[in-house]
């Protein structure tokens, strides 16, 4: 806290300019009017204040707006935003995407800070859903943003927003998140033709059910092994050897290198060995010829 002292004669600030960098902290406190600061916040960004001086300026704004800053001030905070705490930000009502962009720009190139996370949370809650423009903006600044959301939060993403998602935005998503995103992507891209559809849906296939993988196998998509390895094991297991061969096309040869890893390993265990042999890849571990396979889950369903 800076002590309350009278402003020395001739030092009262008439505008926010570079002369203020020569003020001591107590002089800034005494000589800068908070209302003037609020109306000229955009100038602060162009002045090389020390961090200690910025603390004083923040303190002045806090006194002027104890219930939280108005958006007209927030939009021009610039690097003073880095001085804000999550508690400060929770008092704000940020509705403009331009304001969000301006503040994200200040933090550009850094990890998502608690301040930024709180800001995004306030913004998205205020909007009610993650619309396309917001998602566009957030993933541009933080490619991993989407995968930082819980499945519950992802459920508020409208299918139209999925168009903004790039493959790298999904790199760190886990299966639970892809389970939520995949149906939205399927809906978003439903009017595209086969090859274009596959290009768009590919990144989301970690959430695809068996029936959709069977359908894709009929479309000559030539899925690469990296995508195949990210599929849900429970979705891959029911696929026949012929379906997997059609799904992977020329990439089917890659199964040999992955035969010890999920989901390939588990899928091999479910196939007849003579069916696997038709691939000519030397895959081992299938059900030996002459064995009868009982699907107990079907039996339970019938009884």
């Amino acid at each position: 806290e800076v002590e309350k002292t009278a402003c020395p004669s001739g030092k009262k600030a008439r505008e926010i300019d570079e002369s203020l960098i020569f003020y001591k902290k107590w002089e800034l406190e005494a000589c800068v009017d908070a209302a003037l600061l609020a109306t000229q916040m955009d100038r602060v960004n162009a002045i090389p204040f020390t961090y200690e001086q910025l603390d004083v300026l923040k303190h002045k704004l806090d006194e002027l707006y104890p219930q939280g800053y108005p958006e007209s001030v927030i939009q021009h905070l610039g690097y003073l935003f880095l001085k804000m705490s999550p508690e400060d930000i929770r008092k704000w009502n940020v509705t403009s995407l331009e304001t969000l962009k301006a503040l994200l720009e200040v933090n550009k190139g850094h990890e998502m800070s608690p301040q930024v996370a709180t800001l995004i949370d306030r913004f998205v809650k205020g909007r009610g859903q993650l619309d396309k423009d917001t998602l566009d903006t957030l993933t541009a600044f933080y490619p991993g943003y989407l995968c930082s959301l819980s499945p519950e939060e992802l459920s508020s993403v409208p299918p139209s927003s999925i168009w903004a998602v790039r493959p790298q935005d999904l790199d760190t998503c886990d299966p639970r998140q892809l389970d939520v995103l995949y149906p939205k992507a399927r809906l978003a891209f439903q009017n595209m033709n086969g090859s274009e559809y596959f290009v768009k849906i590919q990144s989301f296939l970690g959430g695809a059910p068996t029936e959709d993988l069977k359908a894709l196998s009929q479309q000559n998509v030539s899925m690469d092994l990296a995508t195949f390895m990210k599929l849900r094991t429970d979705a891959v297991l029911p696929l026949t050897v012929a379906e997997v061969q059609k799904l992977l096309g020329p990439h089917v040869e890659g199964l040999k290198a992955e035969e010890r890893h999920r989901p390939v390993r588990d899928w091999i265990l479910r196939q007849r060995q003579d069916d696997l042999d038709t691939l000519g890849l030397g895959l081992q571990g299938g059900i030996p010829n002459g064995y009868l396979v009982l699907d107990l889950s079907m039996q339970e369903a019938l009884s």
């Epitope: 570079e18 960004n45 162009a46 090389p48 204040f49 020390t50 690097y79 720009e105 200040v106």
Partner: nanobody
Framework: LVESGGGLVQPGGSLRLSCAAS????????IGWFRQAPGKEREGVSY????????NYADSVKGRFTISRDNAKNTVYLQMNSLKPEDTAVYSC????????WGQGTLVTVS
């Protein structure tokens, strides 16, 4: 930002400090020189606008210090003449524009 040019100098002597930027272009940034003596508050010493057409100084250094910039070399200078013992401090530069950059400082000892 990296400062250099500090050192030990006798009262009445001169030094020229440099503030060089790497990884970004200084052209668009206003620059301030600051100093902090042991146990004292950091204080502003000098300022130069991004265009270089506006400069400003603390009362304590007016007429003795001169700030300038060479955008081609991505460097800002502080020429310090008629140095006094009370100028002893760590001098650091700061750039303000879209982002903020601070240097680690260079020690100036007048003794």
């Amino acid at each position: 930002l990296v400062e250099s040019g500090g050192g030990l100098v006798q009262p009445g002597g001169s030094l020229r400090l440099s503030c060089a930027a790497s990884g970004f272009t200084l052209d668009y940034y206003a620059i301030g020189w600051f100093r902090q003596a042991p146990g004292k508050e950091r204080e502003g010493v000098s300022y130069i606008s991004s265009s270089g057409d506006s400069t400003n100084y603390a009362d304590s250094v007016k007429g003795r210090f001169t700030i300038s910039r060479d955008n081609a070399k991505n460097t800002v200078y502080l020429q310090m003449n008629s140095l006094k013992p009370e100028d002893t401090a760590v001098y650091s530069c700061a750039a303000a524009g879209g982002f903020r950059y601070w240097g680690q400082g260079t020690l100036v000892t007048v003794s």
